[in-house]
């Protein structure tokens, strides 16, 4: 029987009975928060062979081994993971061994075994036989191996029954418990599974099988299961489901969900039956089971129950993430915040249509409205009193509405209103009238020419660059000396620069009035000599990187209507020179014959230019005499070479800290202090542990159902 879609057993151990007839758990299995120590010996689920997602065990009192519960669990597929893990054993107070002696394969994901004070038999399991990569496994804070004294079957009687493998240069017996070896298949099977009698299974089997070379006798399938057979791909008119089986269209259409409407049921896309269309695709109509590509961002209609959505923080903006059509009105009131412009763009940047009005007031943290980077239509179906559909009032730092050279915005109905925006030039507002098609709708008092732009340099002259010079990490630029009507009112220049892979940046990108700015800023004083052109050397730049640069004059000059006159340049794009690349990564070499070496590597992390070729050098090394010291034809044990792995056993160091030899003199000496890198690594490790623990708690602690 297939059980699912995910089983959560908590609080009452008798809930385990739900697993009675399960052969496959399609989804996850949680066993957790059973605080009363129980006798689990009467609970045994020999039918369970596969979990398609992950297995999580957390705080189950009295459970000493998983072997009796799940004697035949063979495969954990890891189709969906718990924080990158397919097997999590966390804070299991009484667990003495894992004991899953039939576990042969964890298809995807790593394992996390942490804070299990009594747990042994961890160093005796060779996880590399079960997982593809063991580097992401996290096995920490369990019973120290020295206190375990793990013995594999037969070791005491000097008749060892288990096979040996090498882990971390230690060649040892591999077992799950004191009486269960870790199963290994003959090398002749290669990557194939094998039966209990060591006969190789069919290539489509995974984990084990009941008969050799038979695709109907598999315990689990390497790829997909269909009608009793393991198949490499789903047959025609069937679809992949949950990463392990093939189902027909009716099956897919009859998957129900308490969260979604029946018109939002599972879909068929790219040969798979899935919960919803993948990113970039949308249902082909409201009553469709199929997906079609979206033109541009996929439409997502969001509606505000109260008609008007107030955006006064990042949290309130978060509710609009992914929305492309907003049914209702937007009231933006951002007085303060950290990194607000980019946060708002992240959550509101996909909105294309607002059906009601947009009102921006008291938003002193905003410098620009460019965070609404896809807004193209304000319908004005609902308007503010006075028939306004775009209303901008008292925004002390607002300098730019949008970049009108790259923006089409239509206001279908209603007027615009602007007042008390001291840094917003009236010319910017007039430009918006032109673009949005509202010119002629506004009456005289709707755009106040006195209190909009009163503290801005609205009459801007253009500064022209005169020269640019680049090296691998420097740019030197000069520009024409700006001469305002009264030269004494020119205070200085400010140079703004940032990395710009594409030529599409604007002055207000990522900028807000609370100090966040994606541009680096450098102040440049006026050259004392009036004939020398101002300039700057920008250093500490990255090689072969395109930068955007612009310059602003800082002035005091007033012109008519008490408006400030200023000057700034266009944005200049300039690339630094190429440099020597960093070293190639992950160099591996292997011999595939007596006269050949295969060498592989990954590109450098910093190419610092366009890589055109690699240089490979090699030289012959003298043969290692070590290889001749042993008679490999004798039946003696082959020596295992011990390599220093560069790690310190912390426990040993703390036990006897005064036995090291320091320098050339013998004498008592303390352990070397930790390097900064080691300290940083420890800090990151502790942080990572906290993050995981928070994730675990947030995922599993839920309010009781009412």
């Amino acid at each position: 029987e297939i059980c699912g879609p995910g089983i959560d057993i908590r609080n009452d151990y008798q809930q385990l009975k739900r697993l009675e007839n399960c052969t496959v758990i399609e989804g996850y299995l949680h066993i957790l928060l059973i605080s009363k120590a129980e006798d689990y010996r009467s609970y045994r689920f020999p039918k369970l062979t596969v979990i398609t997602e992950y297995l999580l065990l957390f705080r189950v009192a009295g459970l000493e081994s998983l072997g009796d519960l799940f004697p035949n669990l063979t495969v954990i597929r890891g189709w969906k993971l718990f924080y990158n893990y397919a097997l999590v054993i966390f804070e299991m107070t009484n667990l003495k061994d894992i004991g899953l002696y039939n576990l042969r394969n964890i298809t995807r994901g790593a394992i996390r075994i942490e804070k299990n004070a009594d747990l042994c038999y961890l160093s005796t399991v060779d996880w590399s036989l079960i997982l593809d990569a063991v580097s992401n496994n996290y096995i920490v804070g369990n019973k120290p191996p020295k206190e375990c004294g793990d013995l594999c079957p037969g070791t005491m009687e000097e008749k060892p029954m288990c096979e040996k493998t090498t882990i971390n240069n230690e060649y040892n017996y591999r077992c799950w418990t004191t009486n269960r070896c870790q199963k290994m298949c003959p090398s002749t099977c290669g990557k194939r599974a094998c039966t209990e009698n060591n006969e190789c299974c069919h290539p489509e089997c995974l984990g084990s099988c009941s008969a050799p070379d038979n695709d109907t006798a598999c315990v689990a399938c390497r790829h997909y299961y269909y009608a009793g057979v393991c198949v490499p791909a789903c047959p025609p008119n069937t679809y992949r489901f949950e990463g392990w089986r093939c189902v027909d269209r009716d099956f897919c259409a009859n998957i129900l969900s308490a969260e979604s409407s029946d018109s939002e049921g599972f879909v068929i896309h790219d040969g798979e039956c899935m919960q919803e269309c993948p990113s970039g695709f949308i249902r082909n109509g409201s009553q469709s089971m199929y997906c079609i590509p979206c033109e541009g961002p996929c439409p997502k209609v969001c509606e505000e129950e109260k008609k008007t959505k107030t955006i006064d923080s990042v949290t309130s903006a978060q509710m609009l993430q992914g929305c492309t059509i907003f049914k209702g009105n937007l009231l933006i009131n951002i007085r303060r915040g950290n990194n607000i412009a980019s946060e708002l763009e992240n959550f509101m940047g996909l909105i294309e249509v607002v059906t009601g009005y947009v009102k921006i007031r008291h938003s002193h943290a905003l410098v620009s409205l460019s965070f609404l980077k896809n807004l193209r239509l304000i319908l004005g179906e609902e308007q503010l009193e006075g028939n306004y559909s775009f209303y901008v009032l008292d925004n002390q730092n607002l300098q730019q509405l949008w970049d009108w050279d790259h923006r089409n915005l239509t206001i279908k109905a209603g007027k615009m209103y602007f007042a008390f925006n001291p840094k917003l030039c009236v010319s910017e507002i007039y430009r918006m009238e032109e673009v949005t098609g509202t010119k002629g709708r506004q009456s005289k008092g709707d755009i106040n020419t006195r209190n909009n732009g009163e503290r801005a340099s609205c009459e801007s002259d253009v500064l022209h660059f005169t020269s640019t010079t680049t090296s691998k990490n420097r740019i030197i630029i000069t520009w024409h000396r700006y001469r305002p009507p009264d030269y004494r009112d020119l205070i200085s220049f400010t140079v703004y620069y940032k990395e710009a892979p594409f030529k599409n940046v604007t002055e207000y990108d990522g900028q807000d009035a609370c100090g966040s700015n994606s541009w680096n800023m450098v102040d440049v004083d006026l050259p004392p000599n009036k004939d020398v052109e101002p300039g700057i050397l920008l250093h500490g730049l990255k090689p072969w990187t395109q930068y955007a640069v612009y310059v602003k004059a800082v002035t005091l000059t007033m012109v008519e209507n008490d408006h400030i006159r200023g000057a700034k340049s266009e944005i200049l794009y300039i690339r630094t020179n190429a440099s020597v690349p960093s070293i190639p990564l992950d160099v591996l070499s292997a011999s595939n014959s007596s006269s050949q070496l295969i060498v592989k590597w990954n590109p450098p992390s910093l190419p610092n230019g366009n890589l055109s070729y690699y240089i490979v050098r090699w030289q012959r090394q003298p043969q290692d005499g070590y290889l001749y010291r042993h008679n490999y034809c004798s039946k003696d044990k082959i020596p295992i070479r011990k390599y220093a792995d560069g790690t310190i056993d912390i426990e040993e160091v703390t036990e006897n800290p005064k036995t090291e030899v320091c320098g050339g003199e013998k004498g008592p000496c303390c352990a070397c202090p930790k390097t900064e890198a080691e300290k940083q690594a420890e800090k990151e490790e502790a942080e990572y542990r906290k993050v995981f623990e928070n994730f675990l708690h947030n995922s599993i602690f839920v309010p009781r159902p009412e």
Epitope: N254, I255, L256, S257, D262
Partner: antibody, heavy 118, light 107 residues
Framework: EVQLVQSGGGLVKPGGSLRLSCAAS????????MHWVRQAPGKGLEWISV???????YYADSVKGRFTISRDNAKNSLYLQMNSLRAEDTAVYYC????????????WGQGTTVTVSS | EIVLTQSPGTLSVSPGERATLSCRAS??????LHWYQQKPGQAPRLLIK???QSLSGIPDRFSGSGSGTDFTLTISRLEPEDFAVYYC?????????FGQGTKVEIK
């Protein structure tokens, strides 16, 4: 021919248990969600439970915690285990295969009577 | 849960006349509403699926309309065999629910 044949109804005392069965034929049983609907004497239809193709189960509040829906795809059978029965559970019980947007062929069992009385 | 309210409770109509039955949902259910006819001692019979989609074998005098919260079943000319109880049923959200029924009787 697509059909659903029900069995297992009868008279039971309050607090007692009963198991209803519904045998399906003429279609791929495992590919359809299956429902139970009941009708008390002289009253309207009341939806009580569904089991989908994955085995996920959902219940009406009136039976939650007392009734259990299950299926055996190998036997093409649907079940309703009814425990802690009450007088108000007296009704004709129907098993029902509801279609969906893409394939809506509605099939009902013949109905089976459950009487809860002391 | 979504509550379906049918009106009127009883509808008295003469054969050959038009009958209009209403079903209102307590919240929007899109078009996931179905109409059933039930005669005494029989299982229900589906007439209209998804608000307005007709089914083969059902006479075309039965038609459905509506979406969101308001739905209507119309029987254009009542035949003697049409006198029965009619139920609406929503499958939009779990738990599914039925309306309390409208009895169509001979005037």
């Amino acid at each position: 021919e697509v059909q659903l044949v029900q069995s297992g109804g009868g008279l039971v005392k309050p607090g007692g248990s009963l198991r209803l069965s519904c045998a399906a034929s003429g279609f791929t049983f495992s590919s359809f969600a299956m429902h139970w609907v009941r009708q008390a004497p002289g009253k309207g239809l009341e939806w009580i439970s569904v089991i989908d193709t994955r085995g996920a189960t959902y219940y009406a509040d009136s039976v939650k915690g007392r009734f259990t829906i299950s299926r055996d795809n190998a036997k093409n059978s649907l079940y309703l285990q009814m425990n802690s029965l009450r007088a108000e559970d007296t009704a004709v019980y129907y098993c029902h295969r509801l279609g969906n947007f893409y394939y809506h062929m509605d099939v009902w069992g013949q109905g089976t009577t459950v009487t809860v009385s002391s | 849960e979504i509550v379906l309210t049918q009106s009127p409770g009883t509808l008295s109509v003469s054969p050959g006349e038009r009958a209009t039955l209403s079903c209102r949902a307590s919240q929007s259910i899109g078009s996931s509403l179905h109409w059933y006819q039930q005669k005494p001692g029989q299982a229900p019979r589906l007439l209209i699926k998804y608000a307005s989609q007709s089914l083969s074998g059902i006479p075309d005098r039965f038609s459905g309309s509506g979406s969101g919260t308001d739905f209507t079943l119309t029987i254009s000319r009542l035949e003697p065999e049409d006198f029965a109880v009619y139920y609406c049923h929503q499958s939009s959200r779990l738990p599914h629910t039925f309306g309390q029924g409208t009895k169509v009787e001979i005037k």
